[in-house]
């Protein structure tokens, strides 16, 4: 009696069992009763990344540097090629098909985490007793000057924007 | 010990202003930020503004802003709050208290003067 | 400006019972470079000032029994009290002080069953 299931690694064809074609090969014939599977490997450039009856492997993802994308992991026979986005740049999505710049984190914000290729930049508020006066992607909230260590005090405020202003101790209201 | 010690109840008419004092003794007056809360009768607690005495510098919340002023003398140790144009919803006990010490740290307010009820009424 | 919730607004417990407020705000409070938590807790009681119970969110402020306790990071914040005794009856509100406005939550005025 014909099968209705097969094993792993196995597939249904004219009321048979065939092997299926290794990761990195695809499917040239389907086996018979007196022969096995016909599987090639893939071609240059090209991959199967799972045991298939493909009969055309897939083409290795472009990393299309006209869209700030670059290399980050050369595909095989059976894997895809991974990219990322050039420095300053981040992906779109998870599938990473284009970059966009990271974002910068303005006066009155720090970096909270460092922007990757697949991450934008995480921005935070300074709270009080720190600031950030500039517009930047790597800069955290610096704390503002401590006048008293150097033996001044404070002649005007910090905000989140600007540094606590120092003077000498005898200009006291 | 530290201590502040506020001004007496006062009582208002609508459309006039009122100036509550804090007279601050036990820590150096000049580097502490003197914050000033109000709360209205059965309300909860709402920060009005505050003042760094030793350079002037202040911070109001914008509701308050342009109708609150406050100030302080370092020869006596003492904050002041002015606020302007009093309605009968400005009724309230208002407080000082203090923040941070120039240290940057401790900007909660650990002391708290009595409270000044001011009542503003026809 | 970073709104704080308090809740219950009310409770009603009696004494030697475990007491918990919480707090939100709606921004984190949670520093990253320092990784404080900008949070206060004051204890109000009828006609008197409020009183520092807790700082840092969790740093117990001094003379403040150790039934006293203060948790949480980021948005969610908890003030316990382990064993509630006859003196703790009254109102307690938490405070952002991250950026100004500082402000405060509603309060909640913990009640005699």
């Known amino acids: 009696e014909p099968p209705t299931a097969c094993r792993e690694k196995q597939y249904l064809i004219n009321s048979q069992c065939c092997s299926l074609c290794q990761p990195g090969q695809k499917l040239v014939s389907d086996c018979t009763e007196f022969t096995e599977t016909e599987c090639l490997p893939c071609g240059e450039s090209e991959f199967l990344d799972t045991w298939n009856r493909e009969t055309r492997c897939h083409q290795h993802k472009y990393c299309d540097p006209n869209l700030g994308l670059r290399v980050q992991q050369k595909g095989t026979s059976e894997t895809d090629t991974i990219c990322t986005c050039e420095e300053g740049l981040h992906c779109t999505s998870e599938s990473c098909e284009s970059c966009v710049p990271h974002r910068s984190c303005l006066p009155g914000f720090g970096v909270k985490q460092i922007a990757t290729g697949v991450s934008d930049t995480i921005c935070e508020p300074c709270p009080v007793g720190f600031f950030s006066n500039v517009s930047s992607a790597f800069e955290k909230c610096r704390p503002w000057t401590s006048c008293e260590t150097k033996d001044l005090v404070v002649q005007q405020a910090g905000t989140n924007k600007t540094d606590v202003v120092c003077g000498p101790q005898d200009r006291q209201r | 010990q530290v201590q502040l010690v506020q001004s007496g109840a006062e009582v208002k008419k609508p459309g006039s202003s009122v100036k509550v004092s804090c007279k601050a003794s036990?820590?150096?007056?000049?580097?502490?930020?003197i914050e000033w809360i109000r709360q209205a009768p059965g309300q909860g607690l709402e920060w009005m503004g505050s003042?760094?005495?030793?350079?002037?510098?202040?911070n109001y919340a914008q509701k308050f802003q342009g109708r609150v002023t406050i100030t302080a003398d370092t020869s006596t140790s003492t904050a002041y709050m002015e606020l302007s144009s009093l309605r009968s919803e400005d009724t309230a006990v208002y407080y000082c208290?203090?923040?941070?010490?120039?240290?940057?740290?401790?900007?909660?307010?650990?002391?708290w003067g009595q409270g000044t009820l001011v009542t503003v009424s026809s | 400006d970073i709104q704080m919730t308090q809740s219950p607004s009310s409770v009603s417990a009696s004494v030697g019972d475990r007491v918990t407020i919480t707090c939100r705000a709606s921004?984190?409070?949670?520093?990253?470079?320092?990784?404080?938590?900008?949070l206060a807790w004051y204890q109000q009681k009828p006609g008197k000032a409020p009183k520092l119970l807790i700082y840092?969110?969790?740093s117990l402020q001094s003379g403040v029994p150790s039934r006293f306790s203060g948790s949480g990071s980021g948005t969610d914040f908890t003030l316990t009290i382990s064993s509630l005794q006859p003196e703790d009856f009254a109102t307690y509100y938490c405070?952002?002080?991250?950026?100004?406005?500082?402000?405060f939550g509603q309060g909640t005025k913990v009640e005699i069953k």
């Open positions: 840092w969110a969790s």
């Open positions: 921004q984190s409070l949670t520093f990253s470079v320092n990784q404080k938590n900008y």
């Open positions: 003042i760094l005495p030793g350079s002037g510098s202040t």
């Open positions: 036990g820590y150096t007056f000049s580097t502490s930020w």
């Open positions: 405070q952002h002080y991250y950026s100004y406005p500082w402000t």
């Open positions: 208290a203090r923040g941070d010490d120039g240290s940057y740290v401790r900007w909660y307010f650990d002391h």
